[in-house]
């Protein structure tokens, strides 16, 4: 155990010409305040990735209202060191996201507004328990000055934390096995204390809180003998015993993530996922709430009702995550159809459609029609996505290649007889009817019920409708 | 034809974890977003999020941060939620439905899940 | 977030009838707004996306219109299996969003 310690000692306008403007103003005074990110290993990580080392955020700085036309100088910077508690052993390489924030504190409804100012990463190597290490990053036309080391919390002492040390129990010397303490030489290295209940003769550990099996063996505690029945395990018996080797004890086994983290494996080790609130290798590191300002980008925190959510980020538009640090990405909605690629705009979204396709999703086939053939006569209309034949009269189906009925719907009205003809279809009306449908009744004096006769034509003349 | 198939009614008690299925067939399954719909009994509908199914990238509306998540069997054409340390509030029927661009144009027939103690 | 509102929770109407149910947004949505269909056996269906344009499947006599915030839903010649509860959602700003619904029923 022990703890990664960052000092910031200035945050402000690089060498070189095209100095920043002023992050704040007389209108909008602001104060800084700073982010920091760990990751175990060398791997070049998205700022998005979880903060598996841990992280931590500085207290807000003293406000800062700019001079009218002075120069921006070094921002006043928050009090103190930023502290990054890590609970196992310290892995030597690591990577870190330092992200400096101004919350500005003009008259902005719903409290201040935070924006990114820069952010800076690296991949260092750093034992513990050495000096301070001073580094200098740009981000744009800044430049953040800052010292970082990595301590172990005694009784953990070495470069990774692992070794324990305890005060000598003889003036003299240190028991079996055990070496003095560098550079505690009053002190005894200690054994190491493996997982509680791991079993002194079937287990050992080369780190704090581990459990690891002699041949034979398994279980969580080492305490379960490998079965000595007829070898069902694919990996065949065991050459050193009779019985047969099953897997030891998985990295997961036993959960090794704390506060409701759960547990996957990696190809080296394990990995945690945790619930809000716990962060750190094994979800160990918890406590953070509103006061430690975890919305970025102007989210609004808000406290959570259980322990599963000590905070909820509400995002502004533009914004996700657990603590809006990610930028909506528009285009992760997969918007666009038939291999159009998608371009998130900011103000809107963006289909560029591929060859053959059109429309503000790309969902227009361009080439319906081609080589789509209508039979009989009929005619192609693009659309949708897939094409459709409007058929000539006397003719269906997807393709116009099914003779239609055309009287099939029943056309003819008030019991008019129907006709399939080769122009279309006639109906013989029943007494009283008439009408190209039999839809208008004859009234007994001659009149009908048709309505206004077109120029030329005399109502009632029913041979002139036909 | 294009169909979301969900797996079946869940009872479960305070505190446990549910996790629901939406299958997918009729078309691919990797060109459009997924998402989920909740509907509180004799309630409207709300929008909870989507996952990306090219990705396995999700996205939460506010309210669903924290105990939910959703995830995917790409090689199976599923998506899931799961939903952790359940509360009374979350008795529901939850929807998956795809995106087409403009509208979640094809909806799962729903999963109804009673938290009750 | 924006707010959608369908004022009338209810409707009944009869057979034949033309109904018209709206839907106001809390601001400009660029007609980026979806009409659902939830039957009362919970099936949900898209109807109509982006404003007008109706989804396969769905029959003519469903139509949707509007601008800016305001949106409406026409059933032009209403029928039995039209009962069921519909629902307008914004698609223009995450998170998406629902109206309240308004319930369809027969008189």
């Known amino acids: 155990a022990g703890v990664f310690e960052l000092q910031i000692h200035s945050f402000g306008p690089g060498p070189g010409p095209g100095a920043p403007r002023s992050p704040c103003s007389a209108r909008l005074p602001c104060r800084l305040f700073f982010r920091v990110c760990l990751k175990p290993g060398l791997s070049e990580e998205a700022a998005e990735s979880p903060c598996a080392l841990g992280a931590a955020l500085s207290a807000r700085g003293p406000v800062y209202t700019e001079q009218p036309g002075a120069p921006a100088p070094d921002l006043p910077l928050p009090d103190g060191l930023l502290q990054v508690p890590f609970r196992d052993a310290w892995p030597g390489t690591f990577s870190f996201i330092i992200e400096t924030w101004r919350e500005e504190l003009g008259d902005q409804i719903g409290g201040p507004a935070w924006s990114l100012l820069a952010r800076v990463a690296g991949r260092r190597r750093l034992a513990a328990g050495g000096p301070w290490a001073r580094d200098i990053q740009r981000a744009g036309a800044w430049e953040l000055r800052f010292s970082y080391r990595a301590r172990c919390e005694p009784p953990a002492v070495g470069t990774a934390c692992t070794r324990l040390c305890r005060p000598r129990s003889a003036p003299s010397r240190c028991g079996p096995g055990l070496r003095p303490c560098a550079p505690l030489e009053d002190e005894c290295e200690a054994p190491l204390v493996c997982r509680a209940g791991c079993s002194p003769e079937h287990g050992f550990c080369e780190q704090p809180g581990e459990c690891r099996c002699l041949e034979g063996w398994t279980g969580p505690l080492c305490t379960v003998p490998v079965s000595t029945s007829s070898c069902l395990s694919p990996r065949g018996p065991s050459s050193a015993t009779t019985g047969c080797l099953v897997p030891g004890p998985g990295p997961c086994d036993g959960n090794p993530c704390a506060n409701g983290g759960s547990c996957s494996e990696t190809p080296r080790s394990f990995e945690c996922t945790c619930p809000r609130g716990f962060y750190g290798l094994r979800c160990e590191v918890s406590g953070v709430t509103c006061a430690d300002g975890p919305c970025f980008n102007g989210g609004l925190c808000v406290g959570g009702a259980d322990p599963d959510s000590a905070y909820i980020c509400h995002c502004p538009p533009g914004f996700q995550g657990s603590n809006c640090e990610k930028r909506v990405d528009r285009c992760s909605l997969q918007p666009c159809r038939n291999g159009g690629l998608c371009l998130d705009l900011g103000h809107a979204l963006r289909c560029r459609c591929r060859a053959g396709f059109a429309g503000p999703r790309c969902e227009h086939d361009l080439d319906d029609c081609a080589g789509r053939a209508c039979a009989n006569g009929g005619t192609c209309v693009e659309g949708g996505g897939a094409h459709r034949c409007s058929c000539a009269l006397g003719f269906g189906g997807r393709d116009c290649r099914e003779r239609a009925d055309p009287c099939a719907a029943r056309p003819c009205a008030h019991g008019g007889r129907c006709y399939a003809h080769f122009s279309g279809l006639v109906c013989a009306c029943a007494p009283g009817y008439m009408g190209a449908r039999c839809e208008f009744p004859v009234h007994p004096d001659g009149a009908s019920a048709l309505p206004a006769a077109p120029p030329g034509l005399r109502p009632g003349d029913p041979q002139r409708y036909l | 034809q294009i169909q979301l198939v969900q797996s079946g009614p869940e009872l479960k008690k305070p505190g446990e974890t549910v996790k629901i299925s939406c299958k997918a067939s009729?078309?691919?399954?990797?060109?459009?977003?997924m998402h989920w719909v909740k509907q509180a009994p004799g309630k409207g509908l709300k929008w909870m999020g989507w996952i990306n199914t090219e990705t396995g990238e999700p996205g939460y509306a506010d309210d669903f941060k924290g105990r939910f998540a959703f995830s995917l069997e790409t090689s199976a054409s599923t998506a899931y939620l799961q939903i952790n340390n359940l509360k009374n509030e979350d008795t529901a029927t939850y929807f998956c439905a795809r995106y087409d661009g403009y509208a979640m144009d094809y909806w799962g027939q729903g999963t109804s899940v009673t938290v009750s103690s | 977030d924006i707010q959608m509102t369908q004022t009338t929770s209810s409707l009944s109407a009869s057979l034949g009838d033309r109904v018209t149910i709206s839907c106001r947004a809390s601001?400009?949505?660029?007609?980026?707004l979806n009409w659902y269909q939830q039957k009362p056996d919970g099936t949900v269906k898209l109807l109509i996306y982006?404003?007008?344009r109706l989804h396969s499947g769905v029959p003519s006599r469903f139509s949707g219109s509007g601008s800016g915030t305001d949106y409406s839903l026409t059933i032009s010649n209403l029928e039995l299996e039209d009962i069921a509860t519909y629902f307008c959602?914004?698609?223009?700003?995450?998170?998406?969003?629902f109206g309240g619904g308004t319930k369809l029923e027969i008189k």
């Open positions: 009729g078309y691919t399954f990797t060109d459009y977003s």
């Open positions: 982006h404003t007008s």
């Open positions: 959602q914004q698609g223009d700003m995450l998170p998406w969003t």
């Open positions: 601001q400009d949505i660029s007609n980026y």
